[in-house]
């Protein structure tokens, strides 16, 4: 979910004290105000670790920073899951976890992480480069996506940081970040005040700027926060992808994914809906999951993911992707 | 990244009739389901109203059975709701979804802005 405030724009400073101080301080307050809601905003963050024992082990860990409830997570490899993506998991917070080879296990660590071990050998292993996503759905509100991959130098056994680095709670997080900000605009105000202290205020030449100023514009976190918390897409490489599983068919997809901010949402904010559930105790619920289509006399829908939601009758592969969007 | 509009809704009276459309487009979806769920002003999100899945199966709430229909249409890849015989309890934001089956309930993963469908007199 993306958030944009819009913060007006800096006007140079009248002579005098009002002028100089007057429209700092008057803006202050609208840029800490701004800093302060967005400093909430859900993130998502993404760590991948590969095991020292095994070389083609993957232990992939996603968590929500965020307030809302959780009522879907989609794990995927080779780009999110909507962009040519493959989905190795999904986990409803009450209704079980879905998987697929190559995942061996995806559980829920807490209400609002998971994790997911890979093992991989011959065409399904992934690679050291390969970009793992995690979507956290939070239905209707919102959805937040984030990806991950081991730096290209690191050692077996040692893992990526998380992307952003701090593991923190979501209400932990907030506290900081406007107690962060808050000092920092305290400490901008002091030496402010300073400043014109030891100097007269400059003579400033009317402003040559149309009436109409462009206004600067906030994104959720700051982009500098932004480029300091996040890890871009990292290249994919297709070849690293499974190739016993039906995948997204990519045929190259739009090429303004990578560029998005990992916190935006998919979706646009909607009535506050689900309540938060409690999550069931640890473990897979895929026999559970298997176990109800045997009840019903009829096995899983599927064994992998990417199945036609708009069936063509030429034949599975005669759509681009599962949806039958060309 | 997958887009899901939906359009068809609006003001209607006790007794009539509606049909939502939801435009499915963009790049690729690996999901096993589609439907659409609605949310009534100041209560909860509810279950799947109508639901389809990749075989085909269809899922009603027992509160639309037989009023409402849910087809899809391949070749435009479009979801429809038929609406009929709609009473003031239907009054809500109905959003199109694609997600994924669990115990043979679709969970929505990637859903529209909704429409919002009113019955009153």
């Known amino acids: 979910m993306r958030t944009e405030a819009q913060v007006p724009a800096l006007q140079p400073p009248e002579p005098g004290l009002e002028g100089a101080m007057g429209h700092r301080t008057l803006v202050l307050p609208w840029v800490l105000l701004t800093l302060c809601v967005t400093a909430g905003t859900p993130e998502v963050w993404v760590q991948v670790r590969m095991e020292a024992t095994e070389l083609s082990s993957f232990t992939i860990r996603c968590g929500f920073l965020g307030s809302g409830s959780i009522s879907l997570v989609t794990v995927s490899w080779g780009g999110p899951n909507g962009a040519g993506g493959t989905t190795l998991a999904v986990l409803h917070p009450e209704r079980g976890i879905r998987q697929w080879a190559p995942a061996r296990q995806a559980r829920w660590e807490t209400q609002s992480s998971i994790s997911l071990i890979l093992e991989g050998s011959g065409a399904s292993s992934p690679c050291a480069n390969t970009t793992f996503c995690c979507k956290f759905a939070s239905f209707p509100e919102g959805s937040w996506e984030a990806c991950g991959s081991l730096p290209p130098s690191s050692d077996p056994g040692l893992s990526a940081p998380p992307t952003p680095a701090p593991i923190l709670r979501a209400d932990l997080a907030g506290i900081l970040g406007v107690s962060g900000v808050l000092l920092f605009g305290c400490v901008y105000l002091l030496h402010l005040l300073r400043r014109h202290k030891h100097r007269p205020a400059p003579r400033l030449q009317p402003s040559r700027t149309s009436p109409q100023a462009p206004r600067a514009r906030a994104w959720a976190p700051s982009q500098a926060s932004q480029a300091a918390l996040h890890v871009p897409y990292a290249t994919i490489n297709t070849s690293c992808r499974p190739a016993t599983l039906d995948t997204a068919h990519p045929h190259g997809g739009p090429s303004w994914w990578a560029s998005l901010p990992t916190h935006a949402a998919h979706r646009p904010q909607g009535p506050a809906a689900w309540a938060s559930t409690p999550i069931p105790a640890r473990g897979s619920f895929v026999s559970v999951e298997n176990g109800l289509y045997a009840q019903a006399g009829e096995r899983p829908p599927h064994t992998g993911p990417g199945l036609t939601l708009f069936p063509d009758p030429r034949g599975p592969r005669a759509m681009e992707g599962p949806l039958g969007v060309r | 990244e997958v887009q899901l509009v939906e359009s068809g809704g609006g003001l209607v009276q006790p007794g009539g009739s509606l049909r939502l459309s939801c435009a499915a487009s963009?790049?690729?979806?690996?999901?096993?389901?589609m439907g659409w769920f609605r949310q009534a002003p100041g209560k909860g999100l509810d279950e799947g109203v109508a639901?389809?899945?990749?075989?085909?199966?269809?899922k009603y709430a027992d509160s639309v059975k037989g009023r409402f229909t849910i087809s899809r249409d391949n070749a435009k890849n479009s979801l429809y709701l038929q609406m009929n015989s709609l009473r003031a309890e239907d009054t809500a934001v109905y959003y199109c979804?694609?997600?994924?089956?669990?115990?043979?309930?679709?969970?929505?993963?990637?859903w529209g802005q909704g429409t919002q469908v009113t019955v009153s007199s």
């Open positions: 963009g790049y690729s979806y690996s999901g096993d389901c």
């Open positions: 639901t389809i899945d990749n075989a085909g199966r269809i």
């Open positions: 979804a694609a997600g994924w089956t669990f115990g043979g309930q679709c969970s929505p993963a990637d």
